[in-house]
């Protein structure tokens, strides 16, 4: 089978990824690969900002525009991706540059289904191999990266690198970050003027931009702060060993005085603002089951209380190449039955201290509409319907037939393509609706195909409550009530009057009200009344009555 297409038809050979901690990057900056630009066969052009240096492995599905669809993302902000053309075979760079906007909104963003895995993973505190986020939680402004094709990405004003590693054997979590921000908002490039007499810097200067990794021990529920310095520094009150400050309690501040023989007083005073415990947060799938075929909702839940200032906690999500600074995200207009990978992290004072990845498979979508080939009545009590099944997967059909206000529904085998309806009422209009359904997280019904027919005529039922009364010596008045079932298009009442075996009268009226005059006196007559619906006569109602001896 072909690779699984994304909602927009884009398929990736592997998830876009930037190593979170392993690759050396200049000056702890956020890494983004250049944009890949595809020229489309169909005269559309499309840009893809890939989070992988490996963007040449990105492929485009063959689905052309058939499967192209936009999707929305909602959280702090709502993002509607453009309707993206697909069907590309070349990777010719386009003129100009591509832009990618971060901070909860995206331009030209696409969400790719993950190829391969069926597993749902929810691993807080484990290494996330597929996300590096531009860390700018405090800036209210949107940072726009201007990405040149196959060149180093231009950096946002604030440059930072967040790394996270996990070792399954020691239950420690590691997170670090460095930030350099100039007053003008651009990245600082330090230059050193070479003096004739070398002098030692102060420790305060030397360790001004020291970074710290917080390692969390799930057993002791304590943190260790690892000081990221090249040499073995000394800490006041011997608070550190091998550049590590141990046994730090969550949400408590600790002050560390850092010195070294390569620098002079004053020492660097480092305030360690310890984050909350990792296990106090849980990444929760908040997708409504009814919408699980085309939406994904993810939300960080605080499952235990802590004393840290919640204002200092920021959340970040990355799904495909879309990044959101929200505690909860909602992705919409996704493809049913596709896997999507979202990476998320939580930062405390801009230091990442936990992360989680989720691979979520969207639910089965509603089946398409079956195509009715024909439906017709071939007899008074029968009808037949034939159809072609819908394109998408489904479990069964529901066939409903409605006459006037009565509705009957049947559950039909998914392999049926024809069905005979029995015991129908003659000369009655039936409206049929046929839909396929699938039982997934909820039952999803496909669109119904409709058709109608009118059953053939049949003999009407018998007239009833027939009366014969004498109005004079030689006259009779015959009345009856209409049949319960006319079963045909027309309405006519017939009266046949027989004396012995001889037909003496044959009358037809719109109503069952006959006045029979000039009969012979003292004669036995047989009165037969029946209804005719234009196609068939009904069973006659028969009464016997005699005229009397003439009174004059």
């Amino acid at each position: 089978q072909s690779p699984t297409p994304s909602p927009t038809g884009l398929t990736t050979a592997k998830m876009p990824s930037v190593p979170l901690s392993s690759d050396p990057l200049p000056t702890h900056t956020t890494a983004f690969s250049p944009a890949s630009t595809f020229e489309r066969e169909n005269d559309f052009s499309e840009t893809t900002t890939s989070l992988s240096p490996d963007n040449t492995s990105t492929q485009v599905s063959p689905d052309s525009l058939d499967n192209a669809s936009a999707f929305n993302t909602t959280g702090v902000s709502s993002v509607q991706t453009p309707h993206l053309p697909t069907h590309a075979d070349s990777q010719t760079p386009s003129a100009g540059t591509d832009t990618q906007t971060f901070s909860g909104s995206a331009a030209n963003a696409k969400l790719n289904p993950t190829p391969g895995s069926n597993a749902i993973s929810d691993v807080p505190g484990e290494r996330s191999t597929a996300s590096t986020f531009p860390t700018d939680p405090v800036s209210p402004l949107t940072t726009t990266l201007s990405l040149a094709h196959h060149s180093s990405a231009a950096l946002p004003a604030r440059t930072s690198n967040t790394t996270i590693t996990a070792n399954t054997s020691d239950a420690y979590l590691n997170a670090s970050e460095t930030t350099t921000l100039s007053p003008s908002g651009s990245a600082v490039i330090s230059t050193t003027t070479i003096a004739t007499t070398p002098s030692k810097p102060t420790c305060d200067e030397k360790y001004a931009n020291i970074t710290v990794d917080y390692l969390y021990n799930k057993e002791t529920k304590l943190f260790t702060a690892k000081l990221n310095v090249n040499e073995n520094v000394e800490c006041g009150n011997n608070t550190c060993t091998n550049n590590e400050v141990h046994n730090l309690t969550e949400c408590k501040n600790a002050s560390v005085s850092i010195s070294h023989n390569s620098c002079t007083a004053p020492d660097k005073t480092l305030i360690l603002d310890v984050p909350p415990g990792v296990e106090k947060f849980q990444l929760h799938d908040c997708t409504q089951v009814e919408k699980a075929d085309t939406t994904i909702c993810l939300k960080w839940k605080n499952i235990e209380t802590f004393t840290c200032d919640t204002q200092n906690i920021t959340y970040r999500f990355q799904c495909g190449n879309m990044i959101f600074d929200n505690k909860e995200i909602k992705l919409e207009n996704l493809e049913p039955e596709h896997e999507y990978k979202c990476d998320s992290e939580i930062l405390y004072n801009n230091h990442k201290f936990t992360n989680a990845s989720k691979i979520i498979k969207t639910d089965f979508g509603s089946p398409g509409e079956p195509q009715i080939i024909f439906c017709r009545s071939e007899a008074a009590h029968q009808g037949v319907i034939t159809w072609n099944p819908p394109q998408r997967s489904f479990h069964n059909f529901t066939l409903c037939y409605i006459k006037e206000t009565e509705k009957d529904c049947l559950n039909l085998d998914k392999n049926l393509i024809k069905y005979d309806l029995q015991n129908l009422k003659p000369y009655t209009k039936y409206v049929l609706s046929l839909h396929a359904y699938i039982i997934a997280k909820v039952q999803r019904n496909g669109s119904a195909a409709m058709c109608h027919f009118t059953t053939k005529s049949a003999p009407p039922s018998q007239v009833w409550n027939m009366t014969v009364s004498m109005t004079s010596d030689n006259s009779m008045h015959v009345k009856c009530r209409p049949p319960r079932d006319r079963n045909g298009p027309h309405e006519r009442y017939h009266l046949e009057v027989e004396a012995g075996n001889t037909l003496v009268r044959n009358e037809s009226h719109k109503n069952c009200d006959f006045r029979v005059k000039d009969l012979q006196y003292s004669t036995d007559y047989t009165f037969k009344a029946y209804f005719h619906n234009g196609d068939y006569p009904g069973e006659p109602f028969i009464l016997h009555h005699s005229t009397s001896y003439n009174s004059k």
């Epitope: 195509q371 997967s393 085998d413 393509i417």
Partner: antibody, heavy 123, light 107 residues
Amino acid sequence: EVQLVESGGGLVQPGGSMKLSCAASGFTFSDYYMAWVRQAPKKGLEWVASMSFAGSSTYYGDSVKGRFTISRDNAKTTLYLQMNSLRSEDTATYYCARMYTTDYYLYWYFDFWGPGTMVTVSS
Amino acid sequence: DVQMTQSPSYLAASPGESVSISCKASKSISNYLAWYQQKPGEANKILIYSGSTLQSGTPSRFSGSGSGTDFSLTIRNLEPEDFAVYYCQQYDEKPLTFGSGTKLEIK
């Protein structure tokens, strides 16, 4: 005796087009759903497309959707596969197959196959 | 899509022996499974449908079993003409998918 005979295969360049035909005999062609199945060299079978009795409904595998078109001519008892934007991965033997169809039921398996026609997509 | 995992890929046996081929579906497919035989220069032939129903003309030494996710094709008392490639196919849902095939060779 049910017979299905494919034709129209051969060598075509990437990006090119080709039309395959399948001549059917020995059964009432219009009473059956029909299909194309392919097999890349030294690989397994892959369903390509299916079509309803009169051609009003068509069904495609993901890898060919938007590029291939299945059609039929019931008067000529012939099934067709129009292949556009061909790629090297479309190189395969293409089989015409009849789907198991009764008056009331359709089952998506293949009760009769043709011997196949080879399509090579190469520059 | 429903993935069909067929095993073994190769199987060597002698005439008169019995062999079994396994086919596993990635999700339940009820009994919507067919088995086919493929020989060079011949049209593919359906052997079994609905998991265990022999197609008219299939010799009784062939049998199919299973439902849900696990299926098998058994050939008892192998005949020389049985040496071929065998494929399973699910038809529970579209896209229709096949197993990767089992080549049955003479030992």
